[in-house]
Interface confidence: low
């Protein structure tokens, strides 16, 4: 580069490179200014005038210095199965992903494309391992001493209590009944429960596809209608 | 397009009811829908959504006392055993479909009136 | 739980003056905010989305505005047709919600 700041545009020397954030024009075969996270290029530089950006419209982004004649659509809203974990902004784009009692089946490069609910685990099992943002839930049956009889996520096989005289001898499912004796256990009584995150969505109930079926069409977040027209004024 | 409720009518308590609402010309498996009523000279109450995939969420107090389901072509709201504090105009409408600004309701039925007295 | 809280529950305004409706909510709903607006007989009309940006067909006498938990409805210019209840309705989540509608706002036009 010559001795002197360049303003931009201006013409790099043979073999040169432009600085950061610039970039080299190919039809004007200058270097440019780049325009800012947030913004595109409106208008492209010339010889004798630079770049000139204009701010993203609502629901597109540029997430970093760029000469894009547009910016990018955001992502269509989160489904009903996820939490937006980061807003579309003109910086950024939205992110989504499970809600807590779900966990990602089928990932995309930002955020999750099929959520899953997870499994529980049916009366007699226990959770073995603990669903994470990625996994599913692991059951296993309870061992002998052990029991659960909840249907749950998060509940883990619990020992039976210890009687003086046994009115009903427990099983996988069921917690040992004794004579009205007072028992003991030989654990920390009640149902032992994983932490689960809070939600900013109801928790539902309903049945999802299981994460082993082939992604269909029906799995992808859905690409919403075009916008609602503006009115008079518009922004 | 347009949405509009029927099955609305004068119910004892305690008897069953369910409220159908009619789309015409948008696809239920596009958009979400909603549920909302009116006591007489009362401010709007939201009883519950059926999202574009058919999961439902309710109001808190609406839970239990109202079901949300739905066809390739209605949305039905079942009050499962009505009071009299049930009396109300019930509208259904369909959310604006467009993912940047949240929730909102663009069409909106003309609301059918349930009636509860013995 | 989330809840939206509207104010004043009434209001009276003269033909060609302005009223400013506000809506609280309890938490911050990042702009998702809208307003309807509803006459005796008829279902509510969507005016606003967004916080600020105007539905199709509204006139442009009605603006919104606001972020984070507090969010206002400015009607300028107010015609006789402008007299009916307004509402504002949270667009941001539905779990632990009573209701995402404020209570309500009544517009008299003198």
């Known amino acids: 580069l010559p001795a002197q700041v360049a303003f931009t545009p201006y013409a790099p020397e043979p073999g040169g490179t432009c600085r950061l954030r610039e970039y080299y024009d190919q039809t004007a075969q200058m270097c440019c200014s780049k325009c800012p996270p947030g913004q595109h290029a409106k208008v492209f530089c010339t010889k004798t005038s630079d770049t000139v950006c204009d701010s993203c419209e609502d629901s597109t982004y540029t997430q970093l210095w760029n000469w894009v004649p547009e910016c990018l659509s955001c992502g269509s809203r989160c489904s009903s199965d996820q939490v937006e974990t980061q807003a579309c902004t003109r910086e950024q784009n939205r992110i989504c992903t499970c809600r807590p009692g779900w966990y990602c089946a089928l990932s995309k490069q930002e955020g999750c494309r099929l959520c899953a609910q997870l499994r529980k685990c049916r009366p007699g099992f226990g959770v073995a391992r603990p669903g994470t943002e990625t996994s599913d839930v692991v059951c296993k049956p309870c061992a002998p001493g052990t029991f659960s009889n909840t249907t749950s996520s998060t509940d883990i096989c619990r020992p039976h209590q210890i009687c003086h005289v046994v009115a009903i001898p427990g099983n996988a499912s069921m917690d040992a009944v004794c004579t009205s004796t007072s028992p003991t256990r030989s654990m920390a009584p009640g149902a032992v429960h994983l932490p689960q995150p809070v939600s900013t969505r109801s928790q539902h109930t309903q049945p999802t596809p299981a994460p082993s079926t082939a992604p269909g069409t029906s799995f992808l977040l859905p690409v919403g209608p075009s916008p609602p027209a503006e009115g008079s004024t518009g922004d | 397009q347009s949405v509009e409720e029927s099955g609305g009518r004068l119910v004892t308590p305690g008897t069953p009811l369910t409220l159908t609402c009619t789309a015409s010309g948008f696809s239920l498996s596009t958009y979400d829908m909603i549920w909302v009523r009116q006591a007489p000279g009362k401010g709007l109450e939201w009883i519950g959504y059926?999202?574009?995939?058919?999961i439902t969420d309710y109001a808190s107090w609406a839970k239990g006392r109202f079901t949300i389901s739905k066809t390739s072509t209605t949305v039905d709201l079942k009050v499962t055993s009505p009071t009299t504090e049930d009396t109300a105009t019930y509208f259904c409408?369909?959310?604006?479909?467009?993912?940047?600004?949240?929730?909102?309701?663009?069409?909106w039925g003309q609301g059918t009136l349930v009636t509860v007295s013995s | 739980a989330l809840v939206m809280t509207q104010t004043p529950a009434s209001v009276e305004v003269a033909v060609g003056g302005t009223v400013t409706i506000k809506c609280q909510a309890s938490?911050?709903?990042?702009?998702?905010l809208a307003w309807y607006r509803q006459k005796p007989g008829q279902p509510p009309k969507l005016l606003i989305y967004g916080a600020s940006k105007l539905a199709s067909g509204v006139p442009s006498r009605f603006s919104g505005s606001g972020s984070g938990t507090e969010y206002t409805l400015t009607i300028s210019g107010v015609q006789c047709d402008d007299a009916a209840t307004y509402y504002c309705?949270?667009?941001?989540?539905?779990?632990?919600?009573?209701?995402?509608f404020g209570g309500g706002t009544e517009v008299v036009v003198k």
């Open positions: 059926i999202w574009s995939d058919g």
């Open positions: 409408a369909r959310d604006v479909g467009y993912a940047g600004y949240g929730y909102y309701f663009d069409l």
């Open positions: 309705q949270q667009g941001y989540t539905s779990s632990n919600v009573d209701n995402p």
């Open positions: 938490q911050s709903i990042t702009n998702y």
